[in-house]
């Protein structure tokens, strides 16, 4: 069984968070990926996703947001720049395949953002300076309001978790709270 | 000792398949993607596509889709390439290499051990 | 896919010669951009991640510098084993493409 897990991301103000989550390419390909936050006692909310169908190695931005999907490779990357401590928490790539729940991809990503910038990033920490241009053709995909037939009643667990799963990827049952969210590009 | 140990040379006919392992020892092998490369006598590199070895989750790139199939063994620490319908131009080494990342999400493409190669040889 | 121009393809240099290599991409990698040394029948090693980023072990006449669509890779002070060809990969985009390759041989 795969463990939910979580992975601990140390940056500072400034950086670039630049993740990927990796996925069952045969079965998820073209579906709708989305990248939300769970904040402590809260049901996840969904700060960007993808076109429906996802379009693929086709950068979406919302605002300091981006995601691509590649689908030859089965990859969803994730960047998020111009980190603000307010950013902290924790995060992860979702699945849309309605009418079914969404899935989610392992792992975790838990963003831990203090003051102040190192002056020499570390080797997956880009510094300010790389500003990310996205095409001006960037769409504006907007994100489903999605609401679980099911009742959370626990807020997700803190740190890496003692809930197994036979797939790599997992039902996600506790999404009640989808924003919609504008896109700048 | 962490490294990266490649099965041994081929020759095959075109239109055959081949099935190239790489065996890890000296870490944890379900904690790095592994990755394929390859490189055609004199000519440079070019990257095949990846696989998680803890998922089993895979990605080709476009030009070998539907020839390549990446796989592992877990229970043995051991990822194998397999390339099907074996033309004269496939004739390279074949690299295994690791993908080292700070964090395992992390958009790093870095591979810092690589295996000796295996060469494969097409020719009728 | 993004293409990764290498240059030159070979050079010959004198031992303590700055040696200079030029990787163009086609487009913006955003330092996302290694450098690898490849000996005769050995399997390349790396030597600089995300633009200009030492590895571990690999002697400081070696860097990297560079940004946007533009990167150079360094040999301060060339020596006897650093005879290899060596190239450059990107990962800002996939698939993970590699330059062409340069050969440095010495005088």
């Known amino acids: 069984a795969t463990k939910l897990t979580e992975e601990k991301y140390e940056l500072k103000e400034g950086q670039t968070l630049d993740v990927k989550c990796d996925y069952t390419l045969e079965k998820f390909a073209s579906s709708q990926k989305a990248w939300q936050i769970i904040r402590d006692g809260e049901m996840p909310k969904t700060l960007a996703c993808t076109e429906r169908p996802s379009k693929n190695s086709h950068p979406v931005q919302v605002g300091r947001i981006i995601l691509e999907d590649y689908h030859d490779h089965g990859l969803l990357r994730v960047r998020m720049v111009n980190l603000q401590v307010e950013d902290s928490g924790l995060y992860q790539c979702v699945i849309y395949q309605p009418p079914k729940e969404p899935h989610m991809l392992f792992d975790r990503i838990r963003l831990v953002v203090t003051k102040g910038f190192s002056g020499t990033p570390g080797s997956n920490e880009n510094s300010t300076q790389n500003v990310y241009k996205i095409p001006p053709t960037t769409t504006k995909a907007l994100c489903p309001l999605y609401t679980s037939p099911r009742t959370v009643t626990q807020a997700p667990p803190k740190s890496t978790a003692d809930v197994s799963t036979p797939d790599s990827e997992i039902n996600l049952t506790n999404v009640t709270d989808i924003i919609r969210v504008p896109v700048f590009n | 000792q962490v490294q990266l140990v490649q099965s041994g040379a081929e020759v095959k006919k075109p239109g055959a398949s081949v099935k190239v392992s790489c065996k890890a020892s000296?870490?944890?092998?379900?904690?790095?993607?592994i990755n394929w490369v390859r490189q055609a006598t004199g000519q440079g590199l070019e990257w095949m596509g990846w696989?998680?070895?803890?998922?089993?989750?895979?990605g080709y790139v476009k030009k070998f889709q539907g020839r390549v199939t990446m796989t592992r063994n877990t229970s043995i620490s051991t990822a194998y390439m397999e390339l099907s319908s074996l033309r004269s131009e496939d004739t390279a080494v074949y690299y295994c290499?690791?993908?080292?990342?700070?964090?395992?999400?992390?958009?790093?493409?870095?591979?810092?051990?690589w295996g000796r190669g295996t060469l494969v040889t097409v020719s009728s | 896919d993004t293409q990764m121009t290498q240059s030159p393809s070979s050079l010959s240099a004198s031992e303590g010669d700055r040696v200079t290599i030029t990787c163009q991409a086609s487009?913006?990698?955003?330092?996302?951009l290694n450098w690898y040394q490849e000996k005769p029948g050995k399997a390349p090693k790396l030597l600089i991640y995300h633009a200009s980023n030492l590895e571990t072990g690999v002697p400081s006449r070696f860097s990297g510098s560079g940004s946007g669509t533009d990167y150079t890779f360094t040999i301060s002070s060339l020596q006897p084993e650093d005879i290899a060809t060596y190239y450059c990969?990107?990962?800002?985009?996939?698939?993970?493409?590699f330059g062409g390759g340069t050969k440095v041989e010495i005088k």
């Open positions: 487009q913006d990698i955003f330092n996302d």
């Open positions: 290499a690791r993908r080292r990342a700070v964090y395992r999400s992390s958009w790093e493409w870095y591979f810092d051990l």
């Open positions: 990969q990107q990962y800002g985009n996939l698939p993970l493409t």
């Open positions: 696989m998680n070895p803890n998922r089993g989750n895979t």
């Open positions: 000296g870490y944890t092998f379900t904690s790095y993607d």
